[in-house]
Interface confidence: medium
Protein backbone atom coordinates (compact mmCIF):
# COMPACT_ATOMS: atom_id res chain seq x y z
CA UNK A 1 0.00 0.00 0.00
CA UNK A 2 1.03 3.25 -0.53
CA UNK A 3 1.92 5.79 2.59
CA UNK A 4 0.63 8.97 2.52
CA UNK A 5 2.64 11.82 3.88
CA UNK A 6 2.00 15.40 3.98
CA UNK A 7 4.77 18.37 4.46
CA UNK A 8 4.98 21.99 4.59
CA UNK A 9 7.59 24.41 3.23
CA UNK A 10 8.15 28.18 2.96
CA UNK A 11 8.80 29.48 -0.61
CA UNK A 12 12.80 29.68 -1.03
CA UNK A 13 13.66 27.18 1.68
CA UNK A 14 15.07 23.43 1.27
CA UNK A 15 12.31 20.73 2.14
CA UNK A 16 12.88 17.07 2.84
CA UNK A 17 10.37 14.45 1.21
CA UNK A 18 10.25 11.76 3.84
CA UNK A 19 10.72 8.16 2.59
CA UNK A 20 12.36 5.48 4.45
CA UNK A 21 12.14 1.67 5.28
CA UNK A 22 12.23 0.92 8.89
CA UNK A 23 15.33 1.60 11.13
CA UNK A 24 17.02 -1.31 10.43
CA UNK A 25 16.85 -1.91 6.99
CA UNK A 26 20.00 -2.85 4.43
CA UNK A 27 19.71 -2.29 0.48
CA UNK A 28 21.96 -2.90 -2.15
CA UNK A 29 22.76 0.25 -4.21
CA UNK A 30 22.67 -2.34 -7.11
CA UNK A 31 19.72 -3.84 -6.89
CA UNK A 32 17.09 -1.14 -5.51
CA UNK A 33 15.49 0.76 -8.49
CA UNK A 34 14.21 4.52 -6.63
CA UNK A 35 11.49 6.64 -8.64
CA UNK A 36 11.17 10.19 -7.54
CA UNK A 37 8.03 11.76 -9.73
CA UNK A 38 4.91 13.97 -9.19
CA UNK A 39 1.64 11.94 -8.96
CA UNK A 40 -0.15 14.12 -11.57
CA UNK A 41 1.85 14.58 -14.22
CA UNK A 42 4.45 12.14 -13.75
CA UNK A 43 7.34 14.27 -14.23
CA UNK A 44 10.44 12.94 -13.31
CA UNK A 45 12.14 14.57 -10.09
CA UNK A 46 15.46 12.08 -9.81
CA UNK A 47 15.82 8.35 -9.79
CA UNK A 48 18.36 5.54 -8.67
CA UNK A 49 19.13 2.82 -11.17
CA UNK A 50 21.96 0.48 -10.43
CA UNK A 51 25.08 0.89 -12.95
CA UNK A 52 23.64 4.25 -14.46
CA UNK A 53 25.15 7.57 -13.21
CA UNK A 54 22.91 9.57 -16.10
CA UNK A 55 20.02 11.81 -14.73
CA UNK A 56 19.49 12.76 -17.97
CA UNK A 57 15.75 11.61 -18.08
CA UNK A 58 14.93 13.96 -14.57
CA UNK A 59 12.95 17.60 -15.50
CA UNK A 60 15.07 20.57 -15.67
CA UNK A 61 12.79 22.33 -13.10
CA UNK A 62 14.49 19.60 -10.73
CA UNK A 63 17.78 19.32 -12.38
CA UNK A 64 20.22 20.06 -9.92
CA UNK A 65 17.58 21.10 -7.10
CA UNK A 66 16.25 17.50 -5.70
CA UNK A 67 18.94 15.02 -4.35
CA UNK A 68 18.95 11.66 -2.69
CA UNK A 69 21.77 10.60 -0.28
CA UNK A 70 23.79 7.45 -1.33
CA UNK A 71 24.83 7.13 2.12
CA UNK A 72 20.81 7.38 3.29
CA UNK A 73 19.96 4.51 0.27
CA UNK A 74 21.98 1.83 1.86
CA UNK A 75 19.97 2.61 5.19
CA UNK A 76 16.93 2.01 3.47
CA UNK A 77 16.30 5.75 3.83
CA UNK A 78 14.96 7.03 -0.25
CA UNK A 79 14.30 10.23 1.47
CA UNK A 80 14.09 13.71 -1.52
CA UNK A 81 15.96 17.11 -0.33
CA UNK A 82 14.31 19.41 -2.39
CA UNK A 83 16.43 22.67 -2.48
CA UNK A 84 15.12 26.27 -3.14
CA UNK A 85 11.30 25.70 -3.02
CA UNK A 86 8.61 27.64 -5.72
CA UNK A 87 5.29 27.70 -5.54
CA UNK A 88 5.09 25.29 -8.95
CA UNK A 89 6.74 22.41 -6.31
CA UNK A 90 3.33 22.40 -4.40
CA UNK A 91 2.04 19.15 -5.58
CA UNK A 92 1.91 15.40 -4.94
CA UNK A 93 5.30 13.71 -5.15
CA UNK A 94 5.19 10.20 -5.46
CA UNK A 95 8.38 7.92 -4.34
CA UNK A 96 8.77 4.17 -5.45
CA UNK A 97 10.98 1.55 -4.44
CA UNK A 98 11.70 -1.70 -6.58
CA UNK A 99 13.93 -4.17 -5.53
CA UNK A 100 15.83 -6.30 -8.81
CA UNK A 101 15.91 -9.24 -6.87
CA UNK A 102 12.84 -9.84 -5.76
CA UNK A 103 11.70 -10.03 -8.96
CA UNK A 104 11.49 -5.88 -9.36
CA UNK A 105 8.87 -6.40 -6.82
CA UNK A 106 7.49 -2.67 -5.11
CA UNK A 107 9.69 -2.44 -1.37
CA UNK A 108 8.43 1.17 -0.80
CA UNK A 109 5.74 3.48 -2.05
CA UNK A 110 5.06 7.10 -0.42
CA UNK A 111 3.08 10.06 -1.64
CA UNK A 112 4.32 13.27 0.12
CA UNK A 113 1.89 16.07 -0.53
CA UNK A 114 4.31 19.44 -0.72
CA UNK A 115 2.25 22.50 0.52
CA UNK A 116 4.32 25.52 -0.12
CA UNK A 117 3.64 28.99 1.78
CA UNK A 118 5.29 32.51 1.76
CA UNK A 119 4.77 35.54 4.13
CA UNK A 120 2.60 38.26 2.67
CA UNK A 121 3.79 41.95 2.95
CA UNK A 122 3.06 44.04 5.89
CA UNK A 123 -0.39 44.97 4.35
CA UNK A 124 -0.35 48.96 3.62
CA UNK A 125 -3.79 50.85 3.63
CA UNK A 126 -3.92 53.98 1.96
CA UNK A 127 -5.53 57.21 3.18
CA UNK A 128 -9.05 57.30 2.71
CA UNK A 129 -10.31 59.44 -0.06
CA UNK A 130 -13.72 60.59 -1.40
CA UNK A 131 -15.09 59.36 -4.73
CA UNK A 132 -18.16 61.04 -3.23
CA UNK A 133 -19.93 63.19 -0.28
CA UNK A 134 -21.19 60.31 0.90
CA UNK A 135 -18.39 57.47 0.60
CA UNK A 136 -15.22 56.98 1.60
CA UNK A 137 -12.63 54.61 0.38
CA UNK A 138 -9.58 52.70 1.33
CA UNK A 139 -7.18 50.63 -0.57
CA UNK A 140 -5.42 47.93 1.04
CA UNK A 141 -2.01 46.19 -0.33
CA UNK A 142 -0.23 43.41 0.45
CA UNK A 143 2.24 41.21 -1.82
CA UNK A 144 4.50 38.53 -2.60
CA UNK A 145 2.64 35.87 -0.20
CA UNK A 146 1.68 32.19 -0.88
CA UNK A 147 -1.35 30.86 -1.05
CA UNK A 148 -3.95 32.49 -2.38
CA UNK A 149 -5.07 35.18 0.65
CA UNK A 150 -7.80 35.64 2.48
CA UNK A 151 -8.50 39.50 3.05
CA UNK A 152 -10.60 40.94 5.77
CA UNK A 153 -12.11 44.57 6.74
CA UNK A 154 -12.30 45.18 10.53
CA UNK A 155 -14.37 47.69 12.47
CA UNK A 156 -11.31 48.39 14.66
CA UNK A 157 -13.65 49.62 17.15
CA UNK A 158 -15.47 46.45 18.07
CA UNK A 159 -13.39 43.95 16.11
CA UNK A 160 -16.43 43.30 14.12
CA UNK A 161 -15.76 41.69 10.66
CA UNK A 162 -17.22 43.99 7.86
CA UNK A 163 -19.91 43.08 5.14
CA UNK A 164 -17.67 41.53 2.52
CA UNK A 165 -20.21 42.70 -0.34
CA UNK A 166 -18.40 46.06 0.92
CA UNK A 167 -14.93 45.21 -0.74
CA UNK A 168 -13.40 44.26 -4.00
CA UNK A 169 -10.84 41.86 -3.98
CA UNK A 170 -8.56 41.33 -7.06
CA UNK A 171 -5.66 38.76 -6.72
CA UNK A 172 -2.46 38.60 -8.90
CA UNK A 173 -0.24 35.94 -9.53
CA UNK A 174 3.61 38.19 -10.06
CA UNK A 175 6.53 36.96 -11.60
CA UNK A 176 7.80 34.92 -8.66
CA UNK A 177 4.75 32.43 -8.98
CA UNK A 178 3.61 34.38 -5.93
CA UNK A 179 0.35 36.65 -4.76
CA UNK A 180 0.03 39.94 -4.44
CA UNK A 181 -3.41 41.14 -3.46
CA UNK A 182 -5.29 44.51 -3.80
CA UNK A 183 -8.78 45.31 -1.90
CA UNK A 184 -10.83 48.02 -1.73
CA UNK A 185 -13.18 48.76 0.22
CA UNK A 186 -16.24 51.17 -0.10
CA UNK A 187 -18.09 52.61 3.40
CA UNK A 188 -20.68 55.08 3.83
CA UNK A 189 -19.09 58.75 5.41
CA UNK A 190 -19.05 58.60 9.28
CA UNK A 191 -17.29 61.26 11.77
CA UNK A 192 -15.08 58.88 12.16
CA UNK A 193 -13.63 56.02 10.97
CA UNK A 194 -11.24 53.35 12.63
CA UNK A 195 -11.23 50.48 10.08
CA UNK A 196 -8.00 47.92 9.96
CA UNK A 197 -7.09 45.35 7.02
CA UNK A 198 -6.69 41.91 7.67
CA UNK A 199 -4.34 40.09 4.93
CA UNK A 200 -4.84 35.76 6.22
CA UNK A 201 -2.95 33.23 5.14
CA UNK A 202 -4.33 29.99 6.21
CA UNK A 203 -1.80 27.55 5.38
CA UNK A 204 1.05 29.73 7.70
CA UNK A 205 -2.20 30.02 9.88
CA UNK A 206 -1.15 33.96 10.05
CA UNK A 207 -3.17 37.02 10.14
CA UNK A 208 -1.38 40.42 8.96
CA UNK A 209 -3.37 43.58 10.06
CA UNK A 210 -2.85 47.34 9.54
CA UNK A 211 -5.51 49.83 10.84
CA UNK A 212 -6.81 53.51 9.68
CA UNK A 213 -8.13 56.29 11.22
CA UNK A 214 -10.21 59.02 9.30
CA UNK A 215 -8.67 62.04 10.57
CA UNK A 216 -5.12 60.44 11.92
CA UNK A 217 -3.28 59.67 8.88
CA UNK A 218 -1.07 57.60 10.55
CA UNK A 219 -2.05 54.40 10.64
CA UNK A 220 -2.05 51.80 13.72
CA UNK A 221 0.81 49.05 14.40
CA UNK A 222 0.89 46.81 11.90
CA UNK A 223 0.12 43.48 13.59
CA UNK A 224 0.67 39.83 13.18
CA UNK A 225 -1.21 37.07 15.09
CA UNK A 226 -1.38 33.47 14.57
CA UNK A 227 -5.28 33.32 15.64
CA UNK A 228 -8.05 33.24 12.83
CA UNK A 229 -9.76 36.99 12.45
CA UNK A 230 -12.85 36.10 14.51
CA UNK A 231 -10.40 35.63 17.99
CA UNK A 232 -9.45 39.72 17.70
CA UNK A 233 -6.03 40.22 18.08
CA UNK A 234 -5.08 38.21 21.94
CA UNK A 235 -1.43 36.75 21.20
CA UNK A 236 -0.62 39.42 18.91
CA UNK A 237 3.04 40.55 17.82
CA UNK A 238 3.67 43.86 17.51
CA UNK A 239 5.85 45.05 14.48
CA UNK A 240 8.19 47.77 14.20
CA UNK B 1 -0.27 11.59 -22.96
CA UNK B 2 0.64 8.21 -22.46
CA UNK B 3 0.46 5.39 -25.06
CA UNK B 4 1.53 1.67 -25.28
CA UNK B 5 0.84 -0.32 -28.38
CA UNK B 6 1.16 -4.02 -28.73
CA UNK B 7 1.71 -5.94 -32.23
CA UNK B 8 3.21 -9.19 -33.26
CA UNK B 9 0.27 -11.74 -32.62
CA UNK B 10 -1.40 -14.13 -34.43
CA UNK B 11 -2.17 -17.77 -34.80
CA UNK B 12 1.08 -20.07 -34.78
CA UNK B 13 1.06 -24.07 -34.14
CA UNK B 14 2.43 -25.27 -30.82
CA UNK B 15 6.33 -25.78 -30.97
CA UNK B 16 6.34 -22.12 -33.15
CA UNK B 17 7.69 -19.07 -32.52
CA UNK B 18 5.96 -14.89 -32.08
CA UNK B 19 7.74 -11.94 -31.65
CA UNK B 20 5.91 -9.65 -29.73
CA UNK B 21 6.48 -5.64 -30.27
CA UNK B 22 5.08 -2.75 -27.67
CA UNK B 23 5.92 0.66 -28.91
CA UNK B 24 5.95 2.92 -26.03
CA UNK B 25 5.61 7.02 -26.17
CA UNK B 26 4.98 9.48 -23.72
CA UNK B 27 6.96 8.34 -21.07
CA UNK B 28 10.89 8.23 -20.33
CA UNK B 29 11.47 4.79 -21.52
CA UNK B 30 15.25 4.19 -21.16
CA UNK B 31 14.35 4.44 -17.14
CA UNK B 32 10.89 2.85 -16.47
CA UNK B 33 10.93 -0.74 -15.88
CA UNK B 34 8.32 -2.37 -18.30
CA UNK B 35 6.79 -5.49 -18.19
CA UNK B 36 4.80 -8.39 -20.43
CA UNK B 37 1.76 -9.47 -19.12
CA UNK B 38 -1.03 -11.68 -20.51
CA UNK B 39 -4.58 -12.51 -19.59
CA UNK B 40 -5.84 -16.25 -21.05
CA UNK B 41 -9.91 -16.66 -21.17
CA UNK B 42 -11.79 -16.94 -18.12
CA UNK B 43 -8.10 -16.10 -15.95
CA UNK B 44 -6.40 -13.41 -14.05
CA UNK B 45 -4.38 -11.26 -15.91
CA UNK B 46 -0.11 -13.06 -15.20
CA UNK B 47 3.36 -11.07 -15.34
CA UNK B 48 5.42 -13.06 -17.93
CA UNK B 49 8.43 -11.00 -18.14
CA UNK B 50 10.51 -7.79 -16.38
CA UNK B 51 13.09 -5.51 -17.89
CA UNK B 52 14.74 -2.89 -16.22
CA UNK B 53 16.13 -0.04 -18.22
CA UNK B 54 19.65 -1.54 -18.11
CA UNK B 55 18.27 -4.84 -19.52
CA UNK B 56 18.39 -6.85 -16.16
CA UNK B 57 15.46 -9.46 -16.44
CA UNK B 58 13.27 -11.65 -14.57
CA UNK B 59 10.46 -14.49 -15.92
CA UNK B 60 7.64 -16.14 -14.72
CA UNK B 61 8.51 -19.97 -14.50
CA UNK B 62 5.85 -20.86 -16.70
CA UNK B 63 8.45 -19.27 -19.25
CA UNK B 64 11.59 -19.24 -18.21
CA UNK B 65 14.10 -20.47 -20.83
CA UNK B 66 11.30 -20.38 -23.76
CA UNK B 67 10.55 -16.17 -23.80
CA UNK B 68 13.17 -14.00 -24.22
CA UNK B 69 12.32 -9.82 -23.06
CA UNK B 70 14.62 -7.35 -24.70
CA UNK B 71 13.87 -3.40 -25.35
CA UNK B 72 15.09 -0.66 -27.55
CA UNK B 73 15.96 2.45 -25.45
CA UNK B 74 16.66 4.50 -28.87
CA UNK B 75 13.18 3.63 -30.52
CA UNK B 76 11.33 3.13 -27.50
CA UNK B 77 10.38 -0.20 -28.23
CA UNK B 78 9.53 -3.46 -26.18
CA UNK B 79 10.23 -6.96 -27.40
CA UNK B 80 8.93 -9.90 -26.15
CA UNK B 81 10.71 -13.56 -28.06
CA UNK B 82 8.28 -16.70 -27.54
CA UNK B 83 9.59 -20.06 -28.52
CA UNK B 84 8.40 -23.62 -28.11
CA UNK B 85 5.25 -21.88 -27.86
CA UNK B 86 2.42 -24.14 -25.94
CA UNK B 87 -1.43 -23.69 -26.12
CA UNK B 88 -1.04 -22.81 -22.45
CA UNK B 89 0.58 -20.11 -23.57
CA UNK B 90 -3.00 -18.92 -25.42
CA UNK B 91 -3.74 -15.06 -24.19
CA UNK B 92 -3.72 -11.41 -25.06
CA UNK B 93 -0.45 -9.96 -23.87
CA UNK B 94 -0.51 -6.66 -23.15
CA UNK B 95 2.69 -3.95 -21.86
CA UNK B 96 3.48 -2.06 -19.24
CA UNK B 97 5.71 0.57 -17.99
CA UNK B 98 6.33 0.42 -14.15
CA UNK B 99 7.40 3.03 -12.78
CA UNK B 100 4.52 5.53 -14.52
CA UNK B 101 1.57 4.08 -12.58
CA UNK B 102 3.36 3.55 -9.02
CA UNK B 103 4.44 -0.19 -9.39
CA UNK B 104 0.69 -0.67 -10.37
CA UNK B 105 -0.25 -1.49 -13.70
CA UNK B 106 -3.04 1.30 -15.00
CA UNK B 107 -1.54 1.90 -18.61
CA UNK B 108 -2.42 -0.68 -20.65
CA UNK B 109 -2.92 -1.05 -24.53
CA UNK B 110 -5.09 -2.58 -26.44
CA UNK B 111 -2.93 -5.87 -26.33
CA UNK B 112 -2.06 -8.40 -28.93
CA UNK B 113 -3.38 -11.94 -29.31
CA UNK B 114 -1.56 -14.62 -29.42
CA UNK B 115 -3.22 -18.37 -29.98
CA UNK B 116 -1.65 -21.23 -30.27
CA UNK B 117 -3.08 -24.13 -31.74
CA UNK B 118 -2.35 -28.12 -31.27
Known amino acids: DTQEKEVRAMVGSDVELSCACPEGSRFDLNDVYVYWQTSESKTVVTYHIPQNSSLENVDSRYRNRALMSPAGMLRGDFSLRLFNVTPQDEQKFHCLVLSQSLGFQEVLSVEVTLHVAANFSVPVVSAPHSPSQDELTFTCTSINGYPRPNVYWINKTDNSLLDQALQNDTVFLNMRGLYDVVSVLRIARTPSVNIGCCIENVLLQQNLTVGSQTGNDIGERDKITENPVSTGEKNAATWS | EVQLVESGGGLVQAGGSLRLSCAASGIAFSIDIMDWYRQAPGKERELVAT???????NYADSVKGRFIVSRDNAKNILYLQMNSLKPDDTAVYYCNARRLIYGRTVYWGQGTQVTVSS
Open chain 2, 51 to 57: ISGGGST
